[in-house]
Amino acid sequence: LPAQVAFTPYAPEPGSTCRLREYYDQTAQMCCSKCSPGQHAKVFCTKTSDTVCDSCEDSTYTQLWNWVPECLSCGSRCSSDQVETQACTREQNRICTCRPGWYCALSKQEGCRLCAPLRKCRPGFGVARPGTETSDVVCKPCAPGTFSNTTSSTDICRPHQICNVVAIPGNASMDAVCTSTSPTRSMAPGAVHLPQPVSTRSQHTQPTPEPSTAPSTSFLLPMGPSPPAEGSTGD
Protein backbone atom coordinates (compact mmCIF):
# COMPACT_ATOMS: atom_id res chain seq x y z
CA LEU A 1 0.00 0.00 0.00
CA PRO A 2 1.27 3.54 -0.75
CA ALA A 3 2.23 5.67 2.25
CA GLN A 4 -0.54 7.98 3.34
CA VAL A 5 0.09 11.68 2.64
CA ALA A 6 -0.24 13.77 5.80
CA PHE A 7 -2.11 17.05 5.49
CA THR A 8 -1.07 19.99 7.64
CA PRO A 9 -1.25 20.27 10.53
CA TYR A 10 0.15 16.89 11.48
CA ALA A 11 2.40 15.54 14.21
CA PRO A 12 5.74 14.52 12.71
CA GLU A 13 7.22 11.12 13.39
CA PRO A 14 9.73 11.22 16.26
CA GLY A 15 13.14 12.30 14.95
CA SER A 16 11.81 13.43 11.58
CA THR A 17 11.54 16.95 10.22
CA CYS A 18 8.67 18.77 8.61
CA ARG A 19 8.46 18.79 4.83
CA LEU A 20 9.42 21.51 2.37
CA ARG A 21 7.35 24.69 2.89
CA GLU A 22 6.30 23.57 6.35
CA TYR A 23 7.57 24.53 9.80
CA TYR A 24 7.42 22.91 13.20
CA ASP A 25 5.18 24.91 15.51
CA GLN A 26 6.49 24.57 19.04
CA THR A 27 3.23 25.52 20.73
CA ALA A 28 0.96 23.28 18.65
CA GLN A 29 3.73 20.66 18.33
CA MET A 30 2.66 20.15 14.73
CA CYS A 31 4.05 20.53 11.23
CA CYS A 32 2.16 23.47 9.73
CA SER A 33 2.17 25.28 6.38
CA LYS A 34 4.46 28.22 5.74
CA CYS A 35 3.22 31.26 3.84
CA SER A 36 4.46 31.97 0.33
CA PRO A 37 6.66 34.96 -0.58
CA GLY A 38 4.52 38.10 -0.58
CA GLN A 39 2.44 36.79 2.33
CA HIS A 40 2.68 36.50 6.12
CA ALA A 41 0.96 34.47 8.83
CA LYS A 42 -2.33 36.05 9.88
CA VAL A 43 -3.39 33.14 12.10
CA PHE A 44 -0.98 30.54 13.42
CA CYS A 45 -1.90 26.91 13.28
CA THR A 46 -3.45 24.90 16.09
CA LYS A 47 -3.55 21.12 16.50
CA THR A 48 -6.53 20.98 14.13
CA SER A 49 -6.35 24.11 11.93
CA ASP A 50 -3.61 25.11 9.55
CA THR A 51 -1.81 28.46 9.20
CA VAL A 52 -3.85 31.25 7.59
CA CYS A 53 -1.80 33.56 5.39
CA ASP A 54 -2.52 37.08 4.20
CA SER A 55 -0.91 39.35 1.58
CA CYS A 56 1.73 41.82 2.66
CA GLU A 57 0.47 45.39 2.89
CA ASP A 58 1.80 48.18 0.68
CA SER A 59 5.49 48.99 1.23
CA THR A 60 6.12 45.66 2.98
CA TYR A 61 7.42 42.33 1.70
CA THR A 62 8.48 38.77 2.44
CA GLN A 63 11.04 37.25 0.10
CA LEU A 64 10.94 33.63 1.25
CA TRP A 65 8.47 31.01 2.42
CA ASN A 66 7.86 32.06 6.02
CA TRP A 67 5.65 32.11 9.08
CA VAL A 68 6.31 35.64 10.29
CA PRO A 69 3.28 37.50 11.70
CA GLU A 70 4.31 40.75 10.02
CA CYS A 71 5.93 41.47 6.67
CA LEU A 72 9.21 43.38 6.57
CA SER A 73 9.15 47.08 5.74
CA CYS A 74 10.68 48.07 2.44
CA GLY A 75 13.63 50.43 2.70
CA SER A 76 13.07 54.16 2.35
CA ARG A 77 12.94 55.79 -1.08
CA CYS A 78 16.23 56.12 -2.91
CA SER A 79 18.05 59.40 -2.33
CA SER A 80 18.93 61.88 -5.08
CA ASP A 81 22.41 60.38 -5.52
CA GLN A 82 20.93 56.92 -6.08
CA VAL A 83 18.91 55.05 -8.67
CA GLU A 84 16.26 52.44 -7.85
CA THR A 85 17.46 49.22 -9.46
CA GLN A 86 14.72 47.09 -7.90
CA ALA A 87 11.31 48.36 -6.88
CA CYS A 88 9.60 47.50 -3.58
CA THR A 89 7.04 44.76 -4.21
CA ARG A 90 5.25 42.31 -1.92
CA GLU A 91 8.02 39.81 -2.62
CA GLN A 92 11.18 41.92 -2.66
CA ASN A 93 12.73 44.92 -1.00
CA ARG A 94 13.63 48.09 -2.84
CA ILE A 95 17.27 48.19 -3.96
CA CYS A 96 19.06 51.52 -4.38
CA THR A 97 22.43 51.76 -6.09
CA CYS A 98 24.67 54.77 -6.68
CA ARG A 99 24.20 56.80 -9.83
CA PRO A 100 27.09 57.28 -12.29
CA GLY A 101 29.90 59.37 -10.85
CA TRP A 102 29.22 58.09 -7.34
CA TYR A 103 30.33 55.02 -5.38
CA CYS A 104 28.91 53.17 -2.39
CA ALA A 105 30.64 54.36 0.77
CA LEU A 106 28.38 52.31 3.09
CA SER A 107 26.75 49.21 1.71
CA LYS A 108 23.85 47.23 3.15
CA GLN A 109 22.62 43.70 2.58
CA GLU A 110 21.30 44.63 -0.83
CA GLY A 111 22.22 47.88 -2.56
CA CYS A 112 23.75 50.92 -0.92
CA ARG A 113 23.01 52.87 2.24
CA LEU A 114 25.28 55.85 1.56
CA CYS A 115 26.70 57.06 -1.75
CA ALA A 116 29.62 59.45 -2.12
CA PRO A 117 30.87 61.30 -5.21
CA LEU A 118 33.90 59.78 -6.93
CA ARG A 119 37.10 61.69 -6.16
CA LYS A 120 38.28 63.96 -8.96
CA CYS A 121 42.02 64.05 -9.58
CA ARG A 122 43.19 67.65 -9.89
CA PRO A 123 45.65 68.89 -12.55
CA GLY A 124 49.03 67.25 -12.02
CA PHE A 125 47.37 64.06 -10.85
CA GLY A 126 45.82 61.21 -12.82
CA VAL A 127 43.68 58.22 -12.03
CA ALA A 128 45.81 55.36 -10.65
CA ARG A 129 42.85 53.13 -9.88
CA PRO A 130 39.43 53.86 -11.32
CA GLY A 131 36.38 54.02 -9.10
CA THR A 132 34.07 51.03 -8.87
CA GLU A 133 30.59 50.55 -7.44
CA THR A 134 32.08 50.19 -3.99
CA SER A 135 35.46 51.95 -4.06
CA ASP A 136 36.63 55.49 -4.66
CA VAL A 137 39.05 56.68 -7.33
CA VAL A 138 42.75 56.62 -6.36
CA CYS A 139 44.84 59.50 -7.73
CA LYS A 140 48.60 59.57 -8.26
CA PRO A 141 50.99 62.38 -9.20
CA CYS A 142 51.87 62.39 -12.86
CA ALA A 143 55.34 60.95 -13.37
CA PRO A 144 58.02 62.93 -15.25
CA GLY A 145 57.17 63.00 -18.94
CA THR A 146 53.39 62.77 -18.28
CA PHE A 147 50.71 65.27 -17.38
CA SER A 148 47.05 65.79 -16.61
CA ASN A 149 45.53 69.23 -17.06
CA THR A 150 41.98 68.31 -16.01
CA THR A 151 40.02 67.87 -12.83
CA SER A 152 38.53 64.45 -13.51
CA SER A 153 37.54 61.14 -11.93
CA THR A 154 38.44 59.27 -15.12
CA ASP A 155 41.46 60.92 -16.79
CA ILE A 156 44.86 59.26 -16.47
CA CYS A 157 48.27 60.92 -16.80
CA ARG A 158 49.17 61.22 -20.52
CA PRO A 159 52.63 61.50 -22.10
CA HIS A 160 53.90 64.93 -23.08
CA GLN A 161 54.02 65.53 -26.80
CA ILE A 162 57.50 65.26 -28.32
CA CYS A 163 58.53 68.49 -30.01
CA ASN A 164 61.17 69.02 -32.66
CA VAL A 165 61.73 72.32 -30.93
CA VAL A 166 60.18 72.91 -27.48
CA ALA A 167 58.62 76.31 -26.89
CA ILE A 168 57.46 75.61 -23.32
CA PRO A 169 58.52 72.43 -21.54
CA GLY A 170 55.71 70.26 -20.18
CA ASN A 171 55.18 69.64 -16.49
CA ALA A 172 52.84 67.46 -14.43
CA SER A 173 49.84 69.67 -15.15
CA MET A 174 50.60 70.97 -18.64
CA ASP A 175 51.58 69.46 -21.95
CA ALA A 176 54.73 70.61 -23.70
CA VAL A 177 54.25 73.46 -26.15
CA CYS A 178 56.08 73.08 -29.46
CA THR A 179 57.29 75.71 -31.90
CA SER A 180 55.56 75.96 -35.28
CA THR A 181 57.19 72.85 -36.69
CA SER A 182 54.93 69.79 -36.44
CA PRO A 183 55.35 67.96 -33.16
CA THR A 184 55.19 64.20 -32.82
CA ARG A 185 53.27 62.58 -30.01
CA SER A 186 55.22 60.18 -27.85
CA MET A 187 53.89 56.77 -28.79
CA ALA A 188 54.52 53.19 -27.96
CA PRO A 189 57.01 51.43 -30.27
CA GLY A 190 55.39 50.27 -33.51
CA ALA A 191 52.48 52.64 -33.15
CA VAL A 192 51.33 54.71 -36.09
CA HIS A 193 52.64 58.29 -35.82
CA LEU A 194 50.04 60.97 -36.37
CA PRO A 195 51.12 64.19 -38.06
CA GLN A 196 49.36 66.53 -35.59
CA PRO A 197 48.83 66.37 -31.85
CA VAL A 198 45.67 64.38 -31.18
CA SER A 199 43.65 64.26 -28.01
CA THR A 200 44.08 60.71 -26.81
CA ARG A 201 42.41 61.22 -23.48
CA SER A 202 41.14 57.85 -22.31
CA GLN A 203 37.44 57.62 -21.64
CA HIS A 204 36.79 55.44 -18.62
CA THR A 205 33.12 54.61 -18.58
CA GLN A 206 31.54 53.89 -15.21
CA PRO A 207 30.81 50.23 -14.60
CA THR A 208 27.10 49.59 -14.81
CA PRO A 209 25.84 48.16 -11.53
CA GLU A 210 24.88 44.53 -11.79
CA PRO A 211 21.70 43.48 -10.01
CA SER A 212 22.52 41.99 -6.65
CA THR A 213 21.62 38.40 -6.07
CA ALA A 214 19.08 37.93 -3.31
CA PRO A 215 20.70 37.00 -0.01
CA SER A 216 19.44 34.20 2.19
CA THR A 217 17.43 36.25 4.67
CA SER A 218 17.14 33.54 7.29
CA PHE A 219 15.51 35.94 9.77
CA LEU A 220 12.36 35.61 7.72
CA LEU A 221 12.16 32.03 8.77
CA PRO A 222 11.82 31.58 12.52
CA MET A 223 13.64 28.43 13.51
CA GLY A 224 12.64 26.59 16.63
CA PRO A 225 15.50 24.86 18.39
CA SER A 226 13.46 22.05 19.92
CA PRO A 227 12.91 18.78 18.02
CA PRO A 228 11.74 17.90 15.57
CA ALA A 229 13.92 20.31 13.63
CA GLU A 230 12.48 22.82 11.19
CA GLY A 231 12.18 21.78 7.57
CA SER A 232 13.41 23.92 4.69
CA THR A 233 14.75 27.40 5.20
CA GLY A 234 14.02 28.49 1.66
CA ASP A 235 11.83 27.21 -1.15
Epitope: Q26, T27, A28, A41, K42, V43, F44, T46, K47, T48, S49, V52, P69, E70, P222, M223, G224, P225, S226
Partner: antibody, heavy 119, light 106 residues
Framework: QVQLKESGPGILQPSQTLSLTCTFS??????????VGWIRQPSGKGLEWLAN???????YYNPSLKNRLTISKDTSNNQVFLKITNVDTADTATYYC???????????WGQGVMVSVSS | DIVLTQSPPSLSASLGDKVTITCQTS??????IAWYQQKPGKAPRQLIR???TLMSGTPSRFSGSGSGTDYSFSISNVESEDIATYYC????????FGRGTKLEIK
Protein backbone atom coordinates in the same frame (compact mmCIF):
# COMPACT_ATOMS: atom_id res chain seq x y z
CA GLN B 1 -15.65 47.44 21.15
CA VAL B 2 -13.97 44.43 22.74
CA GLN B 3 -14.85 43.86 26.38
CA LEU B 4 -14.24 40.95 28.77
CA LYS B 5 -15.50 40.43 32.31
CA GLU B 6 -14.56 37.72 34.80
CA SER B 7 -16.82 36.30 37.48
CA GLY B 8 -16.19 33.79 40.26
CA PRO B 9 -17.07 32.75 43.78
CA GLY B 10 -14.98 35.32 45.63
CA ILE B 11 -14.09 33.01 48.49
CA LEU B 12 -13.74 29.25 48.71
CA GLN B 13 -12.09 26.68 50.94
CA PRO B 14 -9.00 24.54 50.33
CA SER B 15 -9.59 21.31 48.32
CA GLN B 16 -12.66 22.78 46.62
CA THR B 17 -12.96 23.37 42.86
CA LEU B 18 -12.75 26.95 41.62
CA SER B 19 -15.08 27.75 38.73
CA LEU B 20 -14.51 30.97 36.79
CA THR B 21 -16.49 32.46 33.92
CA CYS B 22 -15.34 34.97 31.31
CA THR B 23 -18.17 36.74 29.51
CA PHE B 24 -17.11 38.80 26.49
CA SER B 25 -18.51 41.02 23.75
CA UNK B 26 -17.15 42.73 20.63
CA UNK B 27 -15.81 39.48 19.15
CA UNK B 28 -16.88 35.88 18.67
CA UNK B 29 -15.15 32.60 19.43
CA UNK B 30 -16.60 31.27 16.20
CA UNK B 31 -14.30 33.60 14.27
CA UNK B 32 -11.27 31.85 12.77
CA UNK B 33 -8.09 32.69 14.69
CA UNK B 34 -9.65 33.98 17.91
CA UNK B 35 -8.80 32.64 21.35
CA VAL B 36 -9.43 33.41 25.02
CA GLY B 37 -6.95 32.81 27.81
CA TRP B 38 -6.75 32.93 31.59
CA ILE B 39 -3.97 34.59 33.57
CA ARG B 40 -3.71 35.05 37.32
CA GLN B 41 -1.82 37.36 39.66
CA PRO B 42 -1.36 36.81 43.39
CA SER B 43 -1.49 40.10 45.30
CA GLY B 44 1.78 42.02 44.92
CA LYS B 45 3.24 39.36 42.63
CA GLY B 46 3.68 38.74 38.91
CA LEU B 47 1.45 37.37 36.15
CA GLU B 48 1.08 33.64 35.55
CA TRP B 49 -0.43 32.18 32.40
CA LEU B 50 -2.92 29.38 33.06
CA ALA B 51 -4.76 28.18 29.95
CA ASN B 52 -6.02 29.15 26.49
CA UNK B 53 -8.84 27.94 24.26
CA UNK B 54 -9.21 28.63 20.55
CA UNK B 55 -12.09 29.00 18.11
CA UNK B 56 -11.56 25.40 16.94
CA UNK B 57 -11.62 24.10 20.55
CA UNK B 58 -7.87 23.53 20.66
CA UNK B 59 -6.66 23.95 24.26
CA TYR B 60 -3.33 24.72 25.87
CA TYR B 61 -2.44 24.53 29.56
CA ASN B 62 0.41 25.68 31.76
CA PRO B 63 2.42 22.44 32.18
CA SER B 64 2.96 23.01 35.92
CA LEU B 65 -0.81 23.18 36.57
CA LYS B 66 -2.12 21.02 33.72
CA ASN B 67 -3.57 18.22 35.85
CA ARG B 68 -5.71 20.70 37.83
CA LEU B 69 -7.02 22.88 34.99
CA THR B 70 -9.92 22.51 32.58
CA ILE B 71 -10.84 25.20 30.06
CA SER B 72 -14.05 25.13 28.01
CA LYS B 73 -16.28 27.48 26.03
CA ASP B 74 -19.87 28.25 25.17
CA THR B 75 -19.54 29.94 21.79
CA SER B 76 -23.20 30.87 21.42
CA ASN B 77 -23.26 32.69 24.78
CA ASN B 78 -19.81 34.29 24.35
CA GLN B 79 -18.41 32.64 27.45
CA VAL B 80 -15.25 30.79 28.44
CA PHE B 81 -14.91 28.78 31.64
CA LEU B 82 -11.96 27.69 33.76
CA LYS B 83 -12.05 25.08 36.48
CA ILE B 84 -9.21 24.61 38.98
CA THR B 85 -9.51 21.54 41.16
CA ASN B 86 -8.18 20.97 44.67
CA VAL B 87 -7.46 24.62 45.41
CA ASP B 88 -5.02 25.76 48.04
CA THR B 89 -4.18 29.12 49.63
CA ALA B 90 -1.51 29.54 46.93
CA ASP B 91 -4.36 29.87 44.40
CA THR B 92 -5.49 33.11 46.05
CA ALA B 93 -5.11 35.70 43.29
CA THR B 94 -6.79 38.07 40.87
CA TYR B 95 -7.86 36.06 37.82
CA TYR B 96 -7.94 37.73 34.40
CA CYS B 97 -9.33 36.55 31.10
CA UNK B 98 -7.96 38.01 27.89
CA UNK B 99 -8.65 37.79 24.19
CA UNK B 100 -5.88 36.23 22.10
CA UNK B 101 -5.00 37.45 18.62
CA UNK B 102 -4.48 34.90 15.82
CA UNK B 103 -0.73 35.32 16.21
CA UNK B 104 -1.02 34.41 19.89
CA UNK B 105 -0.57 37.50 22.04
CA UNK B 106 -3.09 38.72 24.64
CA UNK B 107 -4.48 41.99 23.26
CA UNK B 108 -7.57 42.79 25.37
CA TRP B 109 -7.95 42.05 29.08
CA GLY B 110 -10.81 41.93 31.51
CA GLN B 111 -10.75 43.92 34.75
CA GLY B 112 -10.00 40.80 36.83
CA VAL B 113 -11.83 39.01 39.63
CA MET B 114 -10.36 38.50 43.08
CA VAL B 115 -10.52 34.94 44.43
CA SER B 116 -9.52 34.07 47.97
CA VAL B 117 -8.88 30.54 49.22
CA SER B 118 -9.18 30.44 52.98
CA SER B 119 -10.07 27.89 55.61
CA ASP C 1 9.21 25.09 29.62
CA ILE C 2 10.75 28.37 28.55
CA VAL C 3 12.21 30.38 31.42
CA LEU C 4 12.07 34.18 31.18
CA THR C 5 14.57 36.27 33.12
CA GLN C 6 13.41 39.88 33.37
CA SER C 7 15.67 42.54 34.86
CA PRO C 8 15.95 44.69 36.79
CA PRO C 9 13.15 43.88 39.28
CA SER C 10 12.80 47.59 39.99
CA LEU C 11 14.29 50.83 38.78
CA SER C 12 14.14 54.47 39.74
CA ALA C 13 14.33 57.21 37.13
CA SER C 14 14.02 60.96 36.88
CA LEU C 15 11.48 62.55 34.57
CA GLY C 16 12.94 62.77 31.08
CA ASP C 17 15.36 59.87 31.61
CA LYS C 18 15.68 56.89 29.29
CA VAL C 19 15.12 53.53 30.95
CA THR C 20 15.66 50.04 29.58
CA ILE C 21 14.29 46.70 30.76
CA THR C 22 15.64 43.40 29.45
CA CYS C 23 14.12 39.97 29.07
CA GLN C 24 16.23 36.89 28.40
CA THR C 25 14.66 33.60 27.32
CA SER C 26 16.04 30.11 27.89
CA UNK C 27 15.65 29.31 24.19
CA UNK C 28 15.12 31.08 20.88
CA UNK C 29 11.58 32.48 20.70
CA UNK C 30 11.86 33.97 17.21
CA UNK C 31 10.86 37.51 18.24
CA UNK C 32 7.56 36.36 19.75
CA ILE C 33 7.71 38.70 22.70
CA ALA C 34 5.19 41.28 23.91
CA TRP C 35 5.43 43.99 26.57
CA TYR C 36 2.68 45.01 28.99
CA GLN C 37 2.19 47.92 31.38
CA GLN C 38 0.24 47.41 34.60
CA LYS C 39 -0.76 50.21 36.94
CA PRO C 40 -1.84 49.46 40.55
CA GLY C 41 -5.32 47.96 40.75
CA LYS C 42 -5.66 47.78 36.95
CA ALA C 43 -5.44 45.06 34.32
CA PRO C 44 -2.31 44.88 32.18
CA ARG C 45 -2.31 46.91 28.96
CA GLN C 46 -0.40 45.73 25.91
CA LEU C 47 2.20 48.18 24.59
CA ILE C 48 4.24 46.14 22.10
CA ARG C 49 3.86 42.92 20.12
CA UNK C 50 6.34 40.85 18.09
CA UNK C 51 9.39 42.47 19.74
CA UNK C 52 9.06 45.98 18.32
CA THR C 53 5.60 46.68 16.85
CA LEU C 54 3.79 49.34 18.86
CA MET C 55 0.13 48.66 19.56
CA SER C 56 -2.35 51.30 18.47
CA GLY C 57 -2.34 54.08 21.09
CA THR C 58 1.13 53.29 22.43
CA PRO C 59 3.19 56.51 22.61
CA SER C 60 6.31 56.58 20.41
CA ARG C 61 8.59 57.04 23.44
CA PHE C 62 8.12 53.29 24.04
CA SER C 63 10.22 50.93 21.92
CA GLY C 64 11.33 47.33 21.81
CA SER C 65 14.12 45.40 20.15
CA GLY C 66 15.90 42.07 20.18
CA SER C 67 16.04 38.63 18.60
CA GLY C 68 16.88 35.05 19.49
CA THR C 69 17.01 34.93 23.28
CA ASP C 70 17.71 38.59 24.17
CA TYR C 71 15.05 41.31 24.17
CA SER C 72 14.79 44.81 25.52
CA PHE C 73 12.13 47.44 26.14
CA SER C 74 12.85 51.16 26.50
CA ILE C 75 11.08 54.34 27.49
CA SER C 76 13.04 57.20 25.95
CA ASN C 77 11.65 60.13 27.88
CA VAL C 78 10.04 58.99 31.13
CA GLU C 79 6.85 60.79 32.13
CA SER C 80 5.01 60.63 35.45
CA GLU C 81 2.19 58.61 33.86
CA ASP C 82 4.72 55.84 33.10
CA ILE C 83 4.90 54.85 36.78
CA ALA C 84 3.82 51.20 36.58
CA THR C 85 5.07 47.62 36.53
CA TYR C 86 6.18 46.31 33.13
CA TYR C 87 6.02 42.66 32.07
CA CYS C 88 7.45 40.79 29.10
CA UNK C 89 5.51 37.86 27.66
CA UNK C 90 7.02 35.19 25.41
CA UNK C 91 4.52 33.48 23.13
CA UNK C 92 6.85 31.50 20.89
CA UNK C 93 6.40 28.25 22.82
CA UNK C 94 3.28 28.26 24.98
CA UNK C 95 3.12 31.44 27.10
CA UNK C 96 5.37 32.70 29.90
CA PHE C 97 5.50 36.07 31.66
CA GLY C 98 8.59 37.71 33.08
CA ARG C 99 8.56 38.56 36.78
CA GLY C 100 8.00 42.25 36.16
CA THR C 101 9.93 45.50 36.59
CA LYS C 102 8.55 48.20 38.86
CA LEU C 103 9.32 51.70 37.57
CA GLU C 104 9.44 54.48 40.15
CA ILE C 105 10.17 58.18 39.77
CA LYS C 106 12.97 59.74 41.86
Amino acid sequence: QVQLKESGPGILQPSQTLSLTCTFSGFSLSTYGVGVGWIRQPSGKGLEWLANIWWDDDKYYNPSLKNRLTISKDTSNNQVFLKITNVDTADTATYYCARIDGTRYFDYWGQGVMVSVSS
Amino acid sequence: DIVLTQSPPSLSASLGDKVTITCQTSQNINKFIAWYQQKPGKAPRQLIRYTSTLMSGTPSRFSGSGSGTDYSFSISNVESEDIATYYCLQYGNLWTFGRGTKLEIK
